[in-house]
Interface confidence: low
């Protein structure tokens, strides 16, 4: 806490400018009007304030807005955002995507901080769902964002938003997350033709049920082994040897190298040896 002291004569700030970098902490506290600071927040980032000086400016805003900052101030916080705690951010009501982008830009290149996570949570909850524009923005800044959400949170993603998802955005998703995302992707891409559909749906197939895999096996998709290994075990088990052969196409030879791994191992165990022998791979059920 900075002590309340009178502002020295002639030092009262008329505007937020570079002269303030020469003010001591107590002078900033005494001579900078909080309302002036709030209206000229966009200037703060252009001025090389020290971290200690930024603490004073934050303190002034906190006093002016004890219930949380208005969006007009939040949008121009810039590097002052890094001084905010998750508790501060929980008081905000951020509705503008531009505000979100501005604050994410400040943290760009760093891992998602608790502050950013809280900001995103507040923003998404305020919107009621994770719409396409928001998802586009978040995955651009944090490719792993989607996979940081719980299955419950993912359930609020509308199918239309799935168009914004790139394969790399799903790299760290676990099976239960893909279980939620797959039906949404299937709905989103349902009007595409066979080969285009497979390209789009491929990254989501870790959540696909058996009947969808059977349907894909009839479309000459030539699924690669990496994708096959990410399929749900319970979805793979009922597939026949012929269906797996059609599903994988020329990649079927890769089953041998994966015969001890799930889901291939479990699938092999449930096949008739005669059927497995037709593959000519030496697989033992």
């Amino acid at each position: 806490e900075v002590e309340k002291t009178a502002c020295p004569s002639g030092k009262k700030a008329r505007e937020i400018d570079e002269s303030l970098i020469f003010y001591k902490k107590w002078e900033l506290e005494a001579c900078v009007d909080a309302a002036l600071l709030a209206t000229q927040m966009d200037r703060v980032n252009a001025i090389p304030f020290t971290y200690e000086q930024l603490d004073v400016l934050k303190h002034k805003l906190d006093e002016l807005y004890p219930q949380g900052y208005p969006e007009s101030v939040i949008q121009h916080l810039g590097y002052l955002f890094l001084k905010m705690s998750p508790e501060d951010i929980r008081k905000w009501n951020v509705t503008s995507l531009e505000t979100l982008k501005a604050l994410l830009e400040v943290n760009k290149g760093h891992e998602m901080s608790p502050q950013v996570a809280t900001l995103i949570d507040r923003f998404v909850k305020g919107r009621g769902q994770l719409d396409k524009d928001t998802l586009d923005t978040l995955t651009a800044f944090y490719p792993g964002y989607l996979c940081s959400l719980s299955p419950e949170e993912l359930s609020s993603v509308p199918p239309s938003s799935i168009w914004a998802v790139r394969p790399q955005d799903l790299d760290t998703c676990d099976p239960r997350q893909l279980d939620v995302l797959y039906p949404k992707a299937r709905l989103a891409f349902q009007n595409m033709n066979g080969s285009e559909y497979f390209v789009k749906i491929q990254s989501f197939l870790g959540g696909a049920p058996t009947e969808d895999l059977k349907a894909l096996s009839q479309q000459n998709v030539s699924m690669d082994l990496a994708t096959f290994m990410k399929l749900r075990t319970d979805a793979v088990l009922p597939l026949t040897v012929a269906e797996v052969q059609k599903l994988l196409g020329p990649h079927v030879e890769g089953l041998k190298a994966e015969e001890r791994h799930r889901p291939v191992r479990d699938w092999i165990l449930r096949q008739r040896q005669d059927d497995l022998d037709t593959l000519g791979l030496g697989l033992q059920g």
Epitope: S148, S150, T172, Q177, T233, R262
Partner: antibody, heavy 119, light 107 residues
Framework: QVQLQESGPGLVKPSETLSLTCTVS??????????WSWIRQPPGKGLEWIGY???????NYNPSLKSRVTISVDTSKNQFSLKLSSVTAADTAVYYC???????????WGQGTMVTVSS | DIQMTQSPSSLSASVGDRVTITCRAS??????LNWYQQKPGKAPKLLIY???SLQSGVPSRFSGSGSGTDFTLTISSLQPEDFATYYC?????????FGGGTKVEIK
């Protein structure tokens, strides 16, 4: 051969926070196929799943404990941790860390650590 | 949450006996059912995963069957080292849940 080892205080006072760490050796916490769980067992009772974490940091907690639980992962140290806040005597248990592996089961367990909540 | 109900809660048997433990899920869990053995003072040990697959290193006298909601763990010929408590666990959906356990005691 992947092994897990729990560490942390054996005695915690009521209303305080229980903190445990699980160190993974012989393998990586960043395995695509694994989630890393905490499971507890009160004396003479059954097993209760607390929650899991994936190496990306994605978590899933048991709703019965969600308001008090935080699980985190440190890939650089090959560790994951449990924090359980506002503990009471009912939280006295053996706490296990475990790997949910490619087969969808807890195939590797730590030896367990007994945590007593008492003043 | 999916409730897992094991029966019986305890049983007495002799060496060489065939022992069957059942586990029922409150809703369908496909084949996402695992079985564990726990001895006093030790961590549980995985026996069977995906309802019927034997974990590496586990004796072949242990077997599992079932799908959907009803599952069975069978020990074809009980050995002295098999006296322990057995738990089923579903990994179909979170929260992951365990059965209450079945204690196998010496008759």
């Amino acid at each position: 051969q992947v092994q897990l080892q729990e560490s942390g205080p054996g005695l915690v006072k009521p209303s305080e926070t229980l903190s445990l760490t699980c160190t993974v050796s012989g393998g990586s916490v960043s395995s695509y196929y694994s989630t890393w769980s905490w499971i507890r067992q009160p004396p003479g009772k059954g097993l209760e799943w607390i929650g899991y974490i994936y190496y990306s940091g994605s978590t899933n907690y048991n709703p019965s404990l969600k308001s008090r639980v935080t699980i985190s992962v440190d890939t650089s140290k090959n560790q994951f941790s449990l924090k359980l806040s506002s503990v009471t005597a009912a939280d006295t248990a053996v706490y296990y860390c475990a790997r949910e592996g490619k087969n969808g089961a807890f195939d590797i367990w730590g030896q367990g650590t007994m945590v007593t909540v008492s003043s | 949450d999916i409730q897992m109900t094991q029966s019986p809660s305890s049983l007495s048997a002799s060496v060489g006996d065939r022992v069957t433990i059942t586990c029922r899920a409150s809703q369908s869990i496909s084949s996402y059912l695992n079985w564990y053995q726990q001895k006093p003072g030790k961590a549980p040990k995985l026996l069977i995963y995906a309802a019927s697959s034997l974990q590496s290193g586990v004796p072949s006298r242990f077997s599992g069957s079932g799908s959907g909601t009803d599952f069975t763990l069978t020990i074809s010929s009980l050995q002295p080292e098999d006296f322990a408590t057995y738990y089923c666990q579903q990994s179909y959906s979170t929260p992951l849940t365990f059965g209450g356990g079945t204690k196998v005691e010496i008759k």
